[in-house]
Interface confidence: medium
């Protein structure tokens, strides 16, 4: 039937990984499916097995090489196909021409650490992981701080419109436990999206000195 809905979405991490999600209403529960990558100007092909992530969606990672190797460029086009086994043959369930640098989602920032903490402020740094050198400085970041009694969704977003791998959080409350997360996005790419949020970094501000407010 033609009236079901289906989606095939993939992102390139800018180095050596293409992550894909295939979702389909009323999908083939017990069928073996895979994603096949077929570049237009490279000698390699790559496949990964789609594994269920929910009732009607499957995901897999095409590992193209060593994590920091630059396997694709801005001129590459990779034909991506979802293939599902039907008896003895494979049937094409979805197909697209994938332009890696138009569909970017970087890895979450790593190595978050408190550089300096005071009663009302905290300086935090991080690193980006497996990001292409092609970006040079053309990256932006979003950060958020979890305050006591609030949820992550309530936390205001702080935007850093340049490649700045540190932040100074101000107007914090003394002697209070906080958590901090950051994510990254290249400026390039029509369908580019934010990386996942980093692992939260927990920190505590210093208590106020007795008799004075610092």
């Amino acid at each position: 039937a033609v009236n079901g809905t289906s989606q095939f979405t993939c992102f390139y991490n800018s180095r050596a990984n293409i992550s894909c999600v295939w979702s389909q209403d009323g999908a083939l529960q017990d069928t073996s499916c895979q994603v096949h990558a077929w570049p237009d100007r490279r000698r390699w092909n790559q496949t990964c097995e789609l594994l269920p992530v929910s009732q009607a969606s499957w995901a897999c990672n095409l590992i193209l090489g060593a994590p920091d190797s630059q396997k694709l460029t801005t001129v590459d086009i990779v034909t991506l196909r979802v293939l599902c086994r039907e008896g003895v043959r494979w049937r094409v369930m979805a197909i697209q021409d994938f332009k890696p640098f138009e569909n970017l989602r970087l890895m979450a920032p790593i190595s978050l650490q408190v550089v300096h903490v005071e009663t009302h402020r905290c300086n935090i740094s991080w690193e980006i992981s497996q990001a292409s050198h092609y970006f040079e400085r053309h990256l932006e970041f979003e950060a958020r701080t979890l305050s006591p009694g609030h949820t992550w969704e309530e936390a205001p977003l702080l935007t850093l419109k340049q490649k700045q791998e540190w932040i100074c959080l101000e107007t914090l409350t003394p002697d209070t436990q906080y958590e901090f997360q950051v994510r990254v996005k290249p400026l390039q790419g029509e369908f580019t999206t934010w990386s996942p949020w980093s692992q939260p970094l927990a920190f505590r501000t210093k208590p106020a000195a007795l008799g004075k407010d610092t």
């Epitope: 039937a1 809905t5 289906s6 095939f8 389909q24 086009i77 034909t79 979802v82 021409d97």
Partner: nanobody
């Protein structure tokens, strides 16, 4: 907004040939997967074939395998469906569709549809 206009349909004798064309407006034609679908009287619309901008195609339904061929001219913003050895059961309205990625069948990602062109195969 991409507009798709099919042409080339008509009445043909069984065993004959037709070439359907689908002309697309828009500057990013080569970015789209282009597909042909058909809908016979009283039946659901069914997938026939798709071709990517890099001219890679999906597999064919057994009913048309070896008889139909898809091609595209990115410079002319046109996709073609060459149909040979036509049979009465190929009678249908043939539709052109475009999408960034084309699920085959369900059509969740179809972005644009043409109005269709009627192919009638008489015995």
């Amino acid at each position: 907004q991409v507009q798709l206009v099919e042409s080339g349909g008509g009445l043909v004798q069984a065993g004959g040939s037709l070439r359907l064309s689908c002309a697309a407006s828009g500057r990013t034609f080569s970015s789209y997967v282009m597909g042909w679908f058909r809908q016979a009287p009283g039946k659901e619309r069914e997938f026939v074939v798709a071709i990517t901008g890099t001219r890679r195609t999906t597999d064919w339904p057994d009913s048309v395998k070896g008889r139909f061929t898809i091609s595209r001219d990115n410079a002319q913003n046109t996709v073609y469906l060459d149909m040979n050895s036509l049979k009465p059961e190929d009678t249908a309205v043939y539709y052109c569709a475009s999408a960034r990625g084309l699920p085959v069948p369900p059509l969740g990602d179809i972005i644009h549809w043409g109005e269709g062109t009627l192919v009638t195969v008489s015995s």
